[in-house]
Interface confidence: low
Amino acid sequence: KESCDVQLYIKRQSEHSILAGDPFELECPVKYCANRPHVTWCKLNGTTCVKLEDRQTSWKEEKNISFFILHFEPVLPNDNGSYRCSANFQSNLIESHSTTLYVTDVKSASERPSKDEMASRPWLLYR
């Protein structure tokens, strides 16, 4: 019998390299059985995760899984950082692994840098 616990399928240490000025959708894959859980996004700030209250979000429903999406329209330099989604379900709080956005300012790079370049050229990152 399939478990009816809510599950959030963000992979551990997942990352996205994106350009400032582009639109971007950050997906939180959510699996649930009956009632849709209350899902929110937060951004990590040190040891706390600050809830993103006034950001546009949406649901994308697919056959076997749903995606709770955080919209960046457009991506801003200060969107750089780590994010986590969490679900409230039957009084339980389920938290995802964090996912990190590496934002490159288009004025600083003529082309999208690789992850290795990001690591070796931290000045490209806005923190």
Partner: antibody
Framework: QVQLQESGPGLVKPSETLSLTCTVS????????WSWIRQPPGKGLEWIGY???????NYNPSLKSRITISVDTSKNQFSLKLSSVTAADTAVYYC??????????????WGQGTLVTVSS | EIVMTQSPATLSLSPGERATLSCRAS???????LSWYQQKPGQAPRLLIY???TRATGIPARFSGSGSGTDFTLTISSLQPEDFAVYYC?????????FGGGTKVEIK
């Protein structure tokens, strides 16, 4: 200011297909969910279904077997097709935009509605 | 499907009076998944409240929403002539999205 305008025939014969289009002006159809809602004369509101600008859909199970909602981002339009109509499908049909908040949604912009009568 | 039940069906009040409209869900919809709409004859519904208590853009402060779980309330603190209309609640906790049957606020 976002505006929505429904268009389509006001009279459909029983067993035929009802086809309506909603044209969005004053804003892009992209990055939003769009919905159809209907209201039989003198009665309450019934949600029909929604479509995301990417084409992802979800329909009311009570109508699912008869509904198709599609989107044409190039024309800033989305459409409803309801097949095998009966007199019970006579209603004012509204298109609406979804406002997304936290993990829920409401309808913030509505068309003025179009009355569709099913009669032979 | 979550069934939304509104009461009373009709509320007869005078301008200046306080209106209290009730909406009950057949199962818990949390506090964040309830909206209220106003509809006048021949017009489309207008969003008043979402997330149970957040006023939509341009909605006067005399409209307020409260409640959680299965019981929600829309309060109009002092009825204005333009407030006489039908009011609907709507849940979006679970699909399909469902509306209540409406409460008509009429002039006494």
């Amino acid at each position: 200011q976002v505006q929505l305008q429904e268009s389509g025939p006001g009279l459909v014969k029983p067993s035929e297909t009802l086809s309506l289009t909603c044209t969005v002006s004053g804003g892009s159809i992209s990055s939003y969910y769009w919905s159809w809602i209907r209201q039989p004369p003198g009665k309450g509101l019934e949600w029909i279904g929604y479509i995301y600008y990417s084409g992802s859909t979800n329909y009311n199970p009570s109508l699912k077997s008869r509904i198709t909602i599609s989107v044409d981002t190039s024309k800033n339009q989305f459409s409803l097709k309801l097949s095998s109509v009966t007199a019970a499908d006579t209603a004012v049909y509204y298109c609406a935009r979804v406002i997304l908040y936290s993990s829920g949604w409401s309808f913030d912009y509505w068309g003025q509605g179009t009355l569709v009568t099913v009669s032979s | 499907e979550i069934v939304m039940t509104q009461s009373p069906a009709t509320l007869s009040l005078s301008p200046g009076e306080r209106a209290t409209l009730s909406c009950r869900a057949s199962q818990s919809v949390s506090s964040s998944y309830l909206s209220w709409y106003q509809q006048k004859p021949g017009q489309a519904p207008r969003l008043l409240i979402y997330g149970a208590s957040t006023r939509a853009t341009g909605i006067p402060a005399r409209f307020s929403g409260s409640g959680s779980g299965t019981d929600f309330t829309l309060t109009i603190s002092s009825l204005q002539p333009e407030d006489f209309a039908v009011y609907y609640c709507q849940q979006d906790y679970n699909l399909p999205l469902t509306f209540g049957g409406g409460t008509k606020v009429e002039i006494k």
